[in-house]
């Protein structure tokens, strides 16, 4: 349940990094509708070392039902999963032949949640139980964040997590999968 059926949309977003120029207005205005065409770059845009359009951060749009025990949301919710590693395209590992690899000791840009939104959801329960209202915290946007090798490894894996989240490695029963588990899975795929 929950993740057995979902819609997946990918959007490349431009990082908000002070040391790089602002993205072209047409990209900024349409960023939530863009579908990763041209790798997030405007067509025919030339490569330049400091060109912000070379830094991409993918927003994956997932539509899923949320649950709590046997109860399930009346309607699916749409959320974002921040995916991929941010960095100049020519320096990323999948760009061998166009340039050099990232230096492990150098700065690292990661695609992480930027803003969250709370959405009130109504959960319908079996057995005639009254519906339950819950507020789920969903990622509303993603950003590229500059990290150094001194950042804690847990921070790389689990941005935006608050202190009282369960510890990693101790999984809930496989009955239902959390958004967080799926996000980690997607992040690790890159």
């Amino acid at each position: 349940q929950g993740w057995q059926a979902f819609k997946n949309d990918a959007t490349e977003i431009i990082p908000e990094l002070g040391e790089y120029p602002e993205p072209p207005p047409e990209l900024e205005n349409n960023k939530t509708m863009n579908r990763a065409e041209n790798g997030g770059r405007p067509p025919h845009h030339p490569f330049e070392t400091k060109d912000v359009s070379e830094y991409s951060c993918r927003e994956l749009h997932f539509t899923r039902y949320v649950t709590d025990g046997p109860c399930r949301s009346a309607k699916p919710v749409t959320e974002l999963v921040c995916s991929g590693q941010c960095g100049p395209a020519r320096l990323l590992p999948n760009a061998i032949g166009r340039g050099k690899w990232w230096r492990p000791s150098g700065p690292d840009f990661r695609c992480i949640p930027d803003r969250y939104r709370a959405q009130r959801v109504q959960l319908l329960c079996p057995g005639g139980e009254a519906p339950r209202a819950r507020k789920v915290r969903l990622v509303a946007s993603c950003k590229c964040k500059r990290l150094t090798r001194f950042h804690n490894q847990s921070e790389l894996k689990d941005f935006g997590t608050e202190a009282a989240r369960p510890q990693k490695g101790r999984k809930p029963r496989p009955r239902a999968r959390s958004a967080k588990a799926n996000q980690a899975e997607l992040e690790n795929a890159y």
Epitope: T67, D68, G69, P172, R175, A179
Partner: antibody, heavy 121, light 106 residues
Framework: EVQLQQSGADLVQPGASVKVSCTAS????????IHWMKQRPDQGLEWIGR????????EFAPKFPGKATFTTDTSSNTAYLQLRGLTSEDTAIYYC??????????????WGQGTLVTVSA | QIVLSQSPAFLSVSPGDKVTMTCRAS?????IHWFQQKPGSSPRSWIY???NLASGVPGRFSGSGSGTSYSLTISRVEAEDAATYYC?????????FGAGTKLELK
């Protein structure tokens, strides 16, 4: 850092009312449900109910609707619990807590430090 | 409402012992949470959704169970574990807590 700061201890007369506050920092209370719990001296925990600060909607455990009232002030990020018609049975520590829900589970990671309400003549 | 019965009500153990406390529900529930409370402090989320340790909880703690029977186990008790442990459910309204298990060290 997420914190729930409650008002100080209160000594009140039987039959009177008391208002306990719970001020949140590190998050916007409109994004979460705020719950209230009761713990009588050397006893277990009892759920009173919850409030949605965004719209003021409330839910109560069966024994509390006539006893407790929840209000919120989103401008000061504060939730309030008002207890009326106090008796010695209401002498307890009252806790506020934040409900977190991740799409699979609901739990209470953050609690206030508690407010002791003593009902005595 | 669902009644949670915790046993034993009181435990006195020596450091290094293995301890298991149980929480039984009057009807089947989906999952349970455990809180630790020390005198003069508010309850702390300890085990989340039956088996997940909250942040900062030592790895010697574990939780398990399903249906109507749940348990919290400490593989090797340490002095700092002395506290009262409460279970809590909200699979069915209203939200309820167990009466607690008080763990004391000899």
């Amino acid at each position: 850092e997420v914190q729930l700061q409650q008002s100080g201890a209160d000594l009140v007369q039987p039959g009177a009312s008391v208002k306990v506050s719970c001020t949140a920092s590190g998050f916007d209370i409109k994004d979460y449900y705020i719950h209230w719990m009761k713990q009588r001296p050397d006893q277990g925990l009892e759920w009173i109910g919850r409030v949605d600060p965004d719209n003021g909607e409330t839910e109560f455990a069966p024994k509390f609707p006539g006893k407790a009232t929840f209000t919120t002030d989103t401008s000061s990020n504060t939730a309030y619990l008002q207890l009326r018609g106090l008796t010695s049975e209401d002498t307890a520590i009252y806790y506020c807590g934040r409900e977190d829900y991740d799409g699979t589970y609901t739990w209470f990671p953050y609690w206030g430090q508690g407010t002791l309400v003593t009902v005595s003549a | 409402q669902i009644v949670l019965s915790q046993s034993p009500a009181f435990l006195s153990v020596s450091p290094g012992d293995k301890v298991t406390m149980t929480c039984r529900a009057s009807s089947s529930i989906s999952y349970i949470h455990w809180f630790q409370q020390k005198p003069g402090s508010s309850p702390r989320s300890w085990i989340y959704a039956t088996s997940n340790l909250a942040s900062g909880v030592p790895g010697r703690f574990s939780g398990s169970g399903s249906g109507t029977s749940y348990s919290l186990t400490i593989s090797r008790v340490e002095a700092e574990d002395a506290a009262t442990y409460y279970c809590q459910q909200w699979s069915s309204d209203p939200l309820t807590f167990g009466a607690g298990t008080k763990l004391e060290l000899k």
